[in-house]
């Protein structure tokens, strides 16, 4: 019979013959002939392969580097790899996440306008008159200024963004 | 390709100061730290530092503290290394690596400094 | 500072022969140990990563054991090609330190 030009699904062209693809998970020994199967092997231990394949070598699992801020999100097997997620608190550096940093602080004197997530840092803003940060903090907004009036009191030291207003008794006037 | 290629040798005198350059290529610069290594004639290999070009956050090994200071320019994608109060115990070679999708994946081709009077 | 000491710091072996390097933390270092090949005069260069992950492109002939305190280095067929200064470095807390080396050559 005339030798195949093309192969059924799962199924690869070598030497005018068709041989079976090794499975996801296993990689290719040696490839079949007239008389044998072709030849698979499963991946070792932190290797996958995710295809029907004729690979000689598996690909090793991403590696989460806790010092880039990387963990394990979903552990990878034998047809699937690692999938990598940034530790709580730290951030991807790019969309594909191969690193992450720290969630930013905002400063005494400035607040956060917005909360850091996974892929976003934190977002700070200069706290207007009128509020104040004393902290440095990835969560805490600009806060108001006590209101020295509402507790019958009155200001004795002026506030600034970085520190509130400090409250008094009213001078009593005598008689 | 990653490729991270540093500045040429140099010949210092004790009490002096030295940059080393290091400009990265083949990849997002603020994606991954660099790391500092240097390495004394037919000695073994010391960590000095790293710096990471995304939010410039640095870490220093005790030893060269308040002699090394790390930094980096964003818009040449270029790392730096500076050493200052030199001594003659400081001649080594001094290497950039990127701590990448795996530690310290990717080597410049080091400068020779050499601290002499 | 974590401490990491290499055993021997120098051997010569034959071609075809199975050879290991130790390499001993002052204490756990969870598996975070990496493996550098410096030949002479070159860069060094990553052979295996996190005790026994083998960086893509490096010969099967390499591979990395061991848990704790306690690892190795083994080639499993001594090749000319394998002469140079390996390096062990842990990855556990900063500072990262280095092995002295050890320093392989062909008899």
């Known amino acids: 019979p005339e030798p195949p030009t093309a192969c059924r699904e799962k199924q690869y062209l070598i030497n005018s013959q068709c041989c079976s693809l090794c499975q996801p998970g296993q990689k290719l020994v040696s490839d079949c002939t007239e008389f044998t199967e072709t030849e698979c092997l499963p991946c070792g231990e932190s290797e996958f392969l995710d295809t029907w394949n004729r690979e000689t070598h598996c690909h090793q699992h991403k590696y989460c580097d806790p010092n880039l801020g990387l963990r394990v999100q979903q552990k990878g097997t034998s047809e699937t790899d690692t999938i990598c997620t940034c530790e709580e608190g730290w951030h991807c550096t790019s969309e594909a996440c191969e690193s992450c940093v720290l969630h930013r602080s905002c400063s005494p004197g400035f607040g956060v306008k917005q909360i850091a997530t996974g892929v976003s840092d934190t977002i700070c803003e200069p706290c207007p008159v009128g509020f104040f940060s004393n902290v440095s903090s990835a969560f805490e907004k600009c806060h108001p200024w006590t209101s020295c009036e509402t507790k019958d009191l009155v200001v004795q030291q002026a506030g600034t963004n970085k520190t509130d207003v400090v409250c008094g008794p009213q001078d009593r006037l005598r008689a | 390709e990653v490729q991270l290629v540093q500045s040429g040798a140099e010949v210092k005198k004790p009490g002096a100061s030295v940059k080393v350059s290091c400009k990265a290529s083949?990849?997002?610069?603020?994606?991954?730290?660099i790391e500092w290594v240097r390495q004394a004639p037919g000695q073994g290999l010391e960590w000095m530092g790293n710096?990471?070009?995304?939010?410039?956050?640095?870490k220093y090994n005790e030893k060269f503290k308040g002699r090394v200071t790390l930094t980096a320019d964003k818009s040449t994608s270029t790392a730096y290394m500076e050493l200052s109060r030199l001594r003659s115990e400081d001649t080594a070679v001094y290497y950039c690596?990127?701590?990448?999708?795996?530690?310290?994946?990717?080597w410049g081709q080091g400068t020779t400094v050499t601290v002499s009077s | 500072d974590i401490q990491m000491t290499q055993s021997p710091s120098s051997l010569s072996a034959s071609v075809g022969d199975r050879v290991t390097i130790s390499c001993r933390a002052s204490?756990?270092?969870?598996?975070?140990l990496n493996w550098y090949q410096q030949k002479p005069g070159k860069v060094p260069k990553l052979l295996i990563y996190?005790?026994?992950r083998l960086r893509s492109g490096v010969p099967s002939r390499f591979s990395g054991s061991g848990s704790g305190t306690d690892y190795t280095l083994t080639i499993s067929s001594l090749q000319p090609e394998d002469v140079a200064t390996y390096y062990c470095?842990?990855?556990?807390?900063?500072?990262?330190?280095f092995g002295q080396g050890t320093k392989l050559e062909i008899k």
């Open positions: 710096f990471h070009p995304y939010n410039d956050d640095t």
């Open positions: 996190f005790t026994s």
């Open positions: 470095q842990q990855d556990r807390k900063l500072p990262w330190t």
């Open positions: 690596a990127r701590r990448g999708k795996l530690p310290f994946d990717s």
């Open positions: 083949g990849y997002t610069f603020t994606t991954f730290p």
């Open positions: 204490q756990d270092i969870s598996n975070y």
